[in-house]
């Protein structure tokens, strides 16, 4: 009979064991264990009848198709075998054990006691067959095994071979190299690789296989295992395999597909190819006159680009547009994208107008092309070029007029200062009460009219000032202080200020320039109590045109001492000292209480100590500070009061041969104007030179040479 055993281990004994087994008996034990296991059988006791080749009684161990062992007897002899310590191992998961006894037994035999167990198969060690073994890595476990792949590979669905994912390779560069995966190492199995070369239309792909070419093949059948196919549109080239590379391939297409197939076996090194784009050839190029083309090549093909540039002093001209360079391209149809442009000489065109200046052309026909030369000059004698610049400008290669010092910036024509169109008499005898000034003697003299419309009736007053530049007037702070009812120092609103320049006779304003104020700047430290720092500036809304009757006065050098005692200076004014005269009358009427025509006087500078003493001796709190100086005569005289507030006290500077504003009419009193020992007090301008330049937004060094020349 047959016994089926399915356990992972067990015991098998002869019938009746440990007693003697019966005669004429046959039992088969079929042992089955799970896949991945084999069966190990060994005997603890064995005692059967001996016979030649175990013909009588025996134990036979077998698989489905193979006898593994036949045992009988008690000891192993030449013709019979006992198991002894031997272990019987099944090759698979099935083992059949058959016990048979014949019809007679001469003596009593106790039979056998056997044990079996399932043992793990190490497939990784035992699998010799390539078609069953793992491609890369094998991992054994009890009851089975599994395969895995190296980095970059994927396990095939057969769970054994390793393939690569290589179906998504796009090449768009004009040249490149494509290889089988892992080249020059053997390519992976079970893979389908797809390489796409996709170039711009107009290019044609040329393929060239290089180095090693080794793809598994077959001696009779063309490329049944692994192969390359090249697809160009509907046309397929190949398959290619073996050890001989295909000849270079000119695809005549901008789009190529390369398919590479490998099966699940073989160890071949693969392939490598390079591809190159070829394009249509464009005609030869001639560089333009006065120009060049880069790069310079014997031949140009589709997509080649050429940069056309011109020699220094010339510009590329294309469709009437000037440019530095022009690029043209070889098109897919073998034509150039554009005609070669021409090179045109650079033209700087008409030079920029110079405010208060003139332009003269050094080159014939007033040429404005490359290397032409012009010269700027200022409208003399009213303006002078800043920093004594040559004023020479050359037309540069960039198409701009260039000066060696200023570059492309235009020169600056600064107003000349302190040079009246009429010479001031340097030695005027002292004239009590002043003297008529000829037009142009005091071209810097300004009449400042302030009309404060915030009061009812409108409050109007006036003062004088001195022109410092085309846009700035210097005056006394007390003239431009808002006549507020408290003692705060706030400038008048700029809307309330009008400045008259070139005014000679107050009855005739037709020749005068009147200007509004853009800014009113009082010295921040002006003190309303003692008139210390009595200095201010008015910026005009528009620069005034300079001429014989309107010219600036020069600022002094920065010197705390101020003008030296006994130096003679001039003060001009309209002598408007009658308190009952309104500004309307000043500007429009011919009232006899004031001078219609500008007056001037010559006054000596008074030693500081003398002036200080003269005011300290008076009743009242008078303070002659270091920011003030005095001028006038000990014996008095109307001349000491002639100047209107803010007017310039000018002294001739021998060094620069110019008139310099050393003082501004500030205060005096309290006695009647022209009384004995009542000196006029003036703001010492030399203490404020830095402040003035700062407000005017000019560095002092720029303009100072005007004074010191």
């Amino acid at each position: 009979h047959t016994v089926e055993l399915n356990n992972m281990f067990g015991q098998i004994q002869s019938p009746g064991y440990p007693d003697s087994y019966p005669s004429d008996s046959e039992v088969t034990w079929n042992i089955t264990v799970p896949d991945g296991f084999r069966i190990k059988l060994y005997f603890m006791h064995f005692n059967l009848e001996s016979s030649y080749l175990c013909e009588y009684d025996y134990v036979k161990v077998e698989t489905e198709d193979q006898v593994l062992a036949t045992f009988c007897g008690r000891e192993t002899t030449d013709t019979e075998q006992t198991p002894g310590q031997e272990v019987v191992l099944s090759p698979g998961s099935f083992m059949s054990i058959t016990f048979r006894s014949d019809f007679s037994n001469e003596e009593r035999f106790t039979g056998f006691d056997a044990h079996y167990m399932a043992v793990d198969v190490d497939e990784c060690k035992e699998r010799e067959d390539e078609e069953l073994s793992c491609d890369h890595y094998c991992h054994n476990y009890i009851g089975g095994y599994y395969c895995s792949c190296r980095f970059g590979y994927i396990l095939h669905t057969d769970n054994r071979t390793c393939r690569v994912e290589c179906s998504d390779n796009l090449f768009t560069q004009r040249t490149g190299v494509i290889t089988s995966p892992d080249f020059p190492n053997p390519y992976p199995k079970s893979s389908e690789c797809l390489y796409t070369i996709e170039l711009e239309e107009g290019f044609m792909v040329n393929l060239q296989f290089e180095d090693i070419f080794d793809i598994e093949d077959h001696p009779e059948v063309p490329c049944p295992y692994d192969y390359i196919k090249i697809k160009v549109g509907p046309k397929v080239l190949g398959p290619f395999c073996g050890e001989k590379a295909p000849e270079p391939i000119s695809t005549q297409s901008h789009s190529v597909l390369i398919l590479f197939h490998s099966d699940n076996s073989g160890e071949n090194r693969g392939w490598r190819l390079s591809y190159r784009a070829a394009g249509n050839e464009c005609p030869e190029l001639q560089p333009p006159v006065h120009g060049k083309i880069e790069p310079s090549q014997a031949k140009y093909f589709f997509k080649d680009q050429v940069l056309v540039s011109c020699d220094t002093g010339y510009k590329v001209l294309k469709d009437n547009v000037e440019m530095d360079t022009f690029q043209i391209e070889c098109l897919k149809d073998g034509t150039w994208s554009n005609k070669i442009p021409t090179c045109k000489i650079v033209d700087c065109r008409a030079p920029g107008e110079l405010e208060h200046g003139l332009i003269t052309f050094s080159t014939r026909n007033n040429l404005t092309t490359y290397k032409s030369e012009i010269k700027y000059s200022c409208q003399e004698p009213y303006y002078k070029m800043l920093n004594n610049n040559t004023g020479i400008y050359t037309c540069s290669a960039q198409g701009v007029w260039m000066n060696k010092v200023l570059g492309r910036s235009l020169p600056t024509c600064l107003p000349e200062c302190g040079q009246p169109s009429r010479s001031l008499p340097s030695l005027v005898k002292r004239i009590i009460g002043g003297r008529n000034a000829e037009p142009g003697l005091f071209p810097w003299q300004a009449l400042i009219v302030v009309e404060d419309t915030s009061r009812v009736p409108n409050d109007k007053w006036f003062g004088s000032g001195a022109l410092l530049s085309a846009s700035w007037i210097l005056t006394a702070a007390h003239v431009l202080r808002s006549q507020r009812r408290d003692t705060t120092v706030i400038p008048v609103s700029k809307e309330h200020v009008t400045v008259y320049l070139g005014l000679h006779d107050v009855r005739d304003k037709s020749g005068a320039v009147n200007s509004s104020a853009a800014r009113v700047v009082l010295h921040p430290d002006f003190n309303i109590q003692n008139y210390n720092h009595d200095i201010a500036l008015v910026q005009l809304q528009e620069p005034v045109p300079l001429g014989p009757h309107v010219m600036p006065v020069c600022l002094p050098r920065l010197e705390p001492e101020g003008p030296a005692p006994h130096m003679l200076g001039l003060v001009a004014g309209w002598g408007i000292s009658n308190p009952n005269v309104t500004v309307d009358e000043i500007i429009s009427s011919g009232t006899r209480t004031l001078s219609d025509v500008l007056q001037y006087v010559k006054l000596p500078v008074v030693p500081h100590a003398e002036c200080k003493t003269s005011y300290e001796s008076r009743s009242g709190n008078y303070s002659v500070t270091e920011n003030m100086f005095c001028a006038g005569y000990y014996e008095g005289g109307k001349d000491t009061c002639l100047g209107d507030s803010g007017g310039a006290f000018v002294i001739f500077d021998d060094l620069s041969q110019r008139w310099v504003v050393q003082g501004l009419v500030s205060w005096g009193g309290p006695e009647e104007c022209g009384s004995k020992q009542v000196y006029g007090v003036y703001t010492k301008v030399s203490n404020y030179v830095d402040w003035v330049w700062e407000q005017m937004g000019l560095p002092q060094s720029v303009v100072e040479p005007q004074v010191e020349r």
């Epitope: 915030s454 009812v456 007053w461 003062g463 009812r485 408290d486 009658n578 308190p579 009952n580």
Partner: antibody, heavy 113, light 112 residues
Framework: QVQLVQSGAEVKKPGASVKVSCKAS????????IEWVRQAPGQGLEWIGE????????DYNERFKDRATFTADTSTSTAYMELSSLRSEDTAVYYC??????WGQGTLVTVSS | DIVMTQSPDSLAVSLGERATINCKSS????????????LAWYQQKPGQSPKLLIY???TRESGVPDRFSGSGSGTDFTLTISSLQAEDVAVYYC????????FGGGTKVEIK
């Protein structure tokens, strides 16, 4: 025509505040100073201060500096005077004046407990 | 502060006669920059707001009868009504605006 119209009479308790308005018409409000003057019953005139509506500049009589505040709303051409910490001696007619020449009709402020 | 002293406190004048009111300031009201004297005269009739008569010490406001005149300079000032009319009965104030303004105490003018 040019005129200044003031708000109506007010009765206030000591310690309270009062705000008197003055609406200008017929001229450019922003460009002229508005002064504030008061007159106690049977007494003379006392200058409180002034404001230039366009710039917001103000001047105050030292006696009122801590208690009076001048403001102006240029969109409605109206000036305001607020007087705080009122006491009985602040009972007076308060006038707004356009820079000396034109006076409002006056606003009587009575301070009484 | 500049103190303004008015005299007399009250004045009774016959119709058609001259009335003179004085005002004295504690310091000069002449502004050396604007060259103006900042003194004004006001008339206040009973139950009315004050009215400007004279500014800058001597300039008559438009619409003011020419019987009203102002004079003086520095610190001493006078308002003169050359021929008093019945409608001139009022309190007259002087005011300085050389610095933060101050008023005189007022002069009451009545008909004798």
């Amino acid at each position: 025509q040019v005129q200044l119209v003031q708000s109506g009479a007010e009765v206030k308790k000591p310690g309270a505040s009062v705000k008197v308005s003055c609406k200008a018409s017929g001229y450019t409000f922003t460009g002229k100073w508005i002064e504030w003057v008061r007159q106690a019953p049977g007494q003379g005139l006392e200058w409180i201060g002034e404001i230039l509506p366009g710039s917001g500049s103000t001047d105050y009589n030292e006696r009122f500096k801590d208690r009076a505040t001048f403001t102006a709303d240029t969109s409605t051409s109206t000036a305001y005077m607020e007087l705080s910490s009122l006491r009985s001696e602040d009972t007076a007619v308060y006038y707004c004046v356009r820079s000396e020449d034109l006076w409002g009709q006056g606003t009587l402020v009575t301070v009484s407990s | 502060d500049i103190v303004m002293t008015q005299s007399p406190d009250s004045l009774a004048v016959s119709l058609g006669e001259r009335a003179t009111i004085n005002c004295k300031s504690s310091q000069s009201l002449l502004n050396s920059v604007t060259r103006k004297t900042y003194l004004a005269w006001y008339q206040q009739k009973p139950g009315q707001s004050p009215k400007l008569l004279i500014y800058w010490a001597s300039t008559r406001e438009s619409g003011v009868p020419d019987r009203f005149s102002g004079s003086g300079s520095g610190t001493d000032f006078t308002l003169t009504i050359s021929s008093l009319q019945a409608e001139d009965v009022a309190v007259y104030y002087c005011k300085q605006s050389y610095t933060l303004p101050t008023f005189g105490g007022g002069t009451k003018v009545e008909i004798k």
